[in-house]
């Protein structure tokens, strides 16, 4: 809370306007000395997406011109603290996590945008942002109050490949069934027909219930 501009109770400077050079001198001399406590701010609650992705911003009040910053995400559950991921970056450069990390991130000034992927309901917990100013000295450590990430597993769905196989099997079955039905119907009709007679097709009223709305042609031989 030592940093002017970041503490909750700011100093009240009731100085007459004629003393502005002293005020300026005070800020030039004392802010580099006292503006040192590194407050880390992060959102209180974040809800992960249905795909298990959660994003939040971790912002730190840098007390100096740090060139090398280390950001670590820690998970606190049942008073146990475990490291989720960590990245060291040079100011102005991209944030690079290890290849197998579940975290990705981008940096912009004193803000780090963190994204955690592959989260499941069992991963619900308090995710703490830890920021370390590694270089140049002095070293500063700031730890946020944590972001409670809630992860809700989506309703279990069958595998998409499995669904495709079921769909293919059903449609193939229907196709062969309709093909067979057509073949049987044709063969029956051809057996009933005399090779020398001519015939006409007339539309007969439906024999099926009204809801079917389908009129099937019947062959009527003309004597």
């Amino acid at each position: 809370m030592a940093c002017l501009g970041f503490q909750r109770h700011k100093a009240q400077l009731n100085l007459a306007t004629r003393t502005w050079p002293c005020t300026l001198l005070f800020f030039l001399l004392f802010i580099p000395v006292f503006c040192k406590a590194m407050h880390v701010a992060q959102p209180a609650v974040v809800l992960a997406s249905s795909r298990g992705i959660a994003s939040f911003v971790c912002e730190y009040a840098s007390p100096g011109k740090a060139t090398e910053v280390r950001v670590t995400v820690l998970r606190q559950a049942d008073s146990q603290v475990t490291e989720v991921c960590a990245a060291t970056y040079m100011m102005g450069n991209e944030l690079t996590f290890l290849d197998d990390s579940i975290c990705t991130g981008t940096s912009s000034g004193n803000q780090v945008n963190l994204t955690i992927q592959g989260l499941r309901a069992m991963d619900t917990g308090l995710y703490i942002c830890k920021v370390e100013l590694m270089y140049p000295p002095p070293y500063y450590l700031g730890i946020g109050n944590g972001t409670q990430i809630y992860v809700i597993d989506p309703e279990p769905c069958p595998d998409s490949d499995f669904l495709l196989w079921i769909l293919a099997a059903v449609s193939s079955g229907l196709f062969f069934y309709s093909f067979l039905l057509t073949a049987v119907s044709l063969s029956k009709m051809l057996k009933k027909r005399s090779p020398l007679t001519t015939g006409v097709y007339v539309k007969m009223p439906p024999t099926e219930p009204e809801c079917e709305k389908q009129f099937q042609p019947y062959f009527i031989p003309i004597n």
């Epitope: 809370m1 406590a37 500063y140 450590l141």
Partner: antibody
Framework: EVKLVESGGGSVKPGGSLKLSCAAS????????MSWIRQTPEKRLEWVSS???????YFPDSVKGRFTISRDNARNILYLQMNSVRSEDTAMYFC?????????????????WGAGTTVTVSS | NIVLTQSPASLAVSLGQRATMSCRAS??????????IYWYQQKSGQPPNLLIY???HLKPGVPARFTGSGSRTDFTLTIDPVEADDAATYYC?????????FGAGTKLELK
Amino acid sequence: EVKLVESGGGSVKPGGSLKLSCAASGFTLSNFDMSWIRQTPEKRLEWVSSFTPDGNTYFPDSVKGRFTISRDNARNILYLQMNSVRSEDTAMYFCARKGPYYYGPRGWFFDVWGAGTTVTVSS
Amino acid sequence: NIVLTQSPASLAVSLGQRATMSCRASESVEGYGTSFIYWYQQKSGQPPNLLIYLTSHLKPGVPARFTGSGSRTDFTLTIDPVEADDAATYYCQQNNEDPLTFGAGTKLELK
């Protein structure tokens, strides 16, 4: 120059009261976590109390309910009100400012100390 | 409460030699991947003066002759080489758990 000056120490009978003051200069006291630490005649250091910028106060069990910590922002002074004093409260009392190199949910450490004021509890 | 045990209680070292003192915690003082141990120097008639914070980091202005190391429960302060101005009592402090506590100190004397 950053400076802390304690005053108000002296001799007091067991069960009595005493109020210590800590005048800060070179910085705004209300912007910092401030604490009282004491050093016993055996040279052991003991944390006594802390006051945060947002007004929260903290005490160890040994003084809880007997000591209170307060602050006068206008005068830039930190106080320690000692009531129901005991012989084990005899010590040199230091006013100290929290170190700036760490911010987080853990306690305090101290980068600026006053010269101290002596409290003697004796019948 | 976490108890910090410092050893030895006193130490006599020749000028230019190395002085090593220990601080052992009754339980781990590690949290968030950091050990919350601090070292102070107190000269006779003066208040304590912060030397090292967060186990190994030197307060600006403190000579590089002072180094802090350790983790979890075992911590060490090393002064190499020792100078005449280093004669003092050295205290360790933890703030990983309330209440914050100090060790009983190690008194460094010069031979």
